[in-house]
Structures are given as structure tokens and as C-alpha cells.
């Protein structure tokens, strides 16, 4: 909606300026254009080989950054966290899919709180803030063969170099391990004025 239009306006105007640089032949504008191409971004997909076993809220630390759809540029992935290298306004997003098939076993409880939390941690001033959360309480009856639930959150945030983004979920054993199902990412939209 409104956020998408604003992003299109910001990103679109930057592309127009970059294209103008080609016409004008200005080296200064060309430098700006190359800077645009180096805008930080990351798209991380779940690495399901090391999923925690509890049902409580846990931090997901295993993500792919360089295989399949996963890519990263001018950001750092370390110890399960996405680290900001450049100050700026970023669009953050996360998509989490939960699923259960009867062949996976019997659920310990049919009432499930399926949640995602996207958190920002600052090292310089030790603090942690939940930037986004989403989810629902579900009743996954044993009478059904298959259950599925998807959460998508996204938002626009001012981030500083060194700040870390992490993702926490409840009931991680229920995560859908496919790269098109469980992922998070960020891309820089503009500098801080």
C-alpha cells in the first residue's frame, strides 16, 4: 500500500537520477550511480539442519546467505545475525511458514502459539528492541492430516552501522524448511540525511 508506493517513489527517483547520469556523462553522477548499485541488501533462507527443539521462543541462528535464492551484499551475516555495515534507512522483511503433517508425529499440544519476532540489537549501547512481530494462536486438531500457517512482516527502519538483526520464532520444530517458505532480509533504501 502506502509503504510500497513510498518505496517505489524513493527507489524510482534514484534510478531516474542514475539514468540521467548516463545521458549527462557526469562522472560525479556516475559515481553516485555506482554507489546505488552497491546499496546493501540481504536475503537469507532457513538452514533447517540445525533447528532448535523446544516450543518456546528461540533465536534462529542457522541461515543460508549464498545458496539458492539467498544472497548478501555489503552486509554481514555472522553468528546467526544480519549485521548492518552502512547507516541508512532499510526495508526489513521476514516470511515464516509453519507446517505439520501427521507423519511428522503427534503434537504435544494442539493449541499452538505460532509467532515471529524481528529484533534489532545494538552492541555500542547494549540494547535489544523488537522491530516487528506477527503470528497467531492456532488450533491444529489431530483430526486433520495437514496444517499450514504463514506469517509475513515488513517495515521501514533507520539502522546504524554495527546494529544486528535477528529472527526469533516459537515452535521452531514446525518451521517449513523450504527456501521459498522461511526467509528474512533487508535492503537499504536511502541514506540518513
Amino acid at each position: 500500500g502506502a509503504v510500497q508506493k513510498e518505496l517505489q517513489h524513493i527507489v524510482g527517483s534514484q534510478h531516474i537520477r542514475a539514468e540521467k547520469a548516463m545521458v549527462d556523462g557526469s562522472w560525479l553522477d556516475l559515481a553516485k550511480r555506482s554507489k546505488l548499485e552497491a546499496q546493501p541488501f540481504a536475503h537469507l533462507t532457513i538452514n533447517a539442519t540445525d533447528i532448535p527443539t523446544g516450543s518456546h521462543k528461540v533465536s534462529l541462528s542457522s541461515w543460508y546467505h549464498d545458496r539458492g535464492w539467498a544472497k548478501i551484499s555489503n552486509m554481514t551475516f555472522s553468528n546467526g545475525k544480519l549485521i548492518v555495515n552502512q547507516d541508512g534507512f532499510y526495508y526489513l522483511y521476514a516470511n515464516i511458514c509453519f507446517r505439520h503433517h501427521e507423519t511428522s508425529g503427534d503434537l504435544a499440544t494442539e493449541y499452538l502459539q505460532l509467532m515471529v519476532y524481528v529484533t534489532k540489537t545494538s552492541i555500542k549501547i547494549p540494547s535489544s528492541h523488537t522491530l516487528m512481530k506477527g503470528g497467531s494462536t492456532k488450533y491444529w486438531s489431530g483430526n486433520s492430516e495437514f496444517h499450514f500457517y504463514s506469517i509475513n512482516v515488513g517495515g521501514f527502519f533507520k539502522l546504524r552501522s554495527g546494529e544486528e538483526i535477528s529472527v526469533e520464532v516459537s515452535n521452531p520444530s514446525l518451521l517449513d524448511p523450504d527456501q521459498d517458505a522461511t526467509y528474512f532480509g533487508a535492503f537499504k533504501v536511502r541514506d540518513i540525511d
Partner: antibody, heavy 122, light 107 residues
């Protein structure tokens, strides 16, 4: 480190009651199902009861149904077993054990308490 | 309830031997089987879960296999620390049962 510390065992007369406790530390207690397993002197392991991570689901072996009650207090990280109408056949070492998976049943028990002895004798 | 039958009840072996213990379920339990090791006066220790998954920290000489009604625990090369009693444990529809145990003793 991850551990379960048990208390509450002892000698009790037939027909009386006893409550066992199991204090958890080193892991998020509220995220895991918990079991009680017993072992009679010189015998094998015998599953007694289980409770889900949130306390909503409880299951019992036929031999203790209606006599034993499992409960938990997640704010105190403690598991309980209330035993009533005790008989000599309940004499055993009782172990509390953590379920390996919090979400699913069936994955086994990966952390065990040290055991506490319950002797039912007149 | 599902009955679990372990064989043999007692097994005499030497250090370095390859040892196999069998566990049979009275009806299919898919892969919902765990193996434990217990030493005298101590609590059991989880070795294998879901029939073949090795528990964290357990030596790789231990392995599990099988599905349905027949399962095996194998110790590829028996070590002095492995002399103990081993139990299988099944899960099926909100019921858990243990096998009667297999004692592995020094030959």
C-alpha cells in the same frame, strides 16, 4: 549446565500419599514436555506419565491412572508427581526426564534427574 | 499397549567387538524408537532417537536402524565404558513403553 534435581522420596505406608518434585535449570523449562519414569529394584524401566510443555496435555500409564497426578509450575521451573493410594508395587526409584522435543511426542528423553527412591512398606 | 521385546537379555562380549541388540515391537511404531544406556545406580542416558538419529555428544560407534516393528542398536567397536544395560523405548499414540533391557557384560 542443564540439570534436573529431584526431591521428595522416602518411606510411606500403603494407601498413603507422597509428592515428588523435580527442579529444572540450564534450559527453558517452559518449552519442553516432561516425563516421570520409574525403576523397581533390580528391574527395568517403566514409563509412568508425561505432561506437555504448557501443561495442557497429560498422559498416564494404565497402572497409575486415577492414582497419580503430574503437574508443573513453569514460573518455578518445577515438575511434580502427586502419588496417592500407594501400594508395594509402586516401590521404585523415580526419575524425572525432559522430552527431547517440545513440540512433538516420541523423540525420547534427553535429560534425566538423579532419581529419588520411594519405598511403600508397612 | 505395545509390547517391546529385546534380545538377547544378556550379551557377553570383549573390547573391540561389534555388538548388535535387537528390539521388536508388537505392532508398527513407524520410527518412534529410542535407545538408552544405563549403568548401575545411575540414570539412563539417551543414545539414539527416532530409530537412527544419534543424540548430541554420543560417540559415533553407536548407531540405530530399523522401522515398523524391528529395530537394532549397533556398537561398532565395544569400548570399556560401553559395558552397561541398554533399553529400547517406543512411542505410539500417547503411550510410552520400554523393553526389558539387554545387559552387555565382559566376556
Amino acid at each position: 549446565q542443564v540439570q534436573l534435581v529431584q526431591s521428595g522420596g522416602g518411606v510411606v505406608q500403603p494407601g498413603r500419599s507422597l509428592r515428588l518434585s523435580c527442579a529444572a535449570s540450564g534450559f527453558t523449562f517452559s518449552g519442553y514436555g516432561m516425563h516421570w519414569v520409574r525403576q523397581a529394584p533390580g528391574k527395568g524401566l517403566d514409563w509412568v506419565t508425561v505432561i506437555s510443555y504448557d501443561g495442557s496435555n497429560k498422559h498416564y500409564a494404565d497402572s497409575v491412572k486415577g492414582r497419580f497426578t503430574i503437574s508443573r509450575d513453569n514460573s518455578k521451573n518445577t515438575l511434580y508427581l502427586q502419588m496417592s493410594s500407594l501400594g508395594p508395587e509402586d516401590t521404585a526409584v523415580y526419575y524425572c526426564a525432559k522430552s527431547l522435543s517440545g513440540t512433538y511426542w516420541g523423540y525420547g528423553m534427553d535429560v534425566w534427574g538423579q532419581g529419588t527412591t520411594v519405598t511403600v512398606s508397612s | 499397549d505395545i509390547q517391546m521385546t529385546q534380545s538377547p537379555s544378556t550379551l557377553s562380549a570383549s573390547v573391540g567387538d561389534r555388538v548388535t541388540i535387537t528390539c521388536r515391537a508388537s505392532q508398527s511404531i513407524s520410527s518412534w524408537l529410542a535407545w538408552y544406556q544405563q549403568k548401575p545406580g545411575k540414570a539412563p542416558k539417551l543414545l539414539i532417537y527416532k530409530a537412527s538419529s544419534l543424540e548430541s555428544g554420543v560417540p559415533s560407534r553407536f548407531s540405530g536402524s530399523g522401522s515398523g516393528t524391528e529395530f537394532t542398536l549397533t556398537v561398532s567397536s565395544l569400548q570399556p565404558d560401553d559395558f552397561a544395560t541398554y533399553y529400547c523405548q517406543q512411542y505410539n499414540r500417547y503411550s510410552w513403553t520400554f523393553g526389558q533391557g539387554t545387559k552387555v557384560e565382559i566376556k
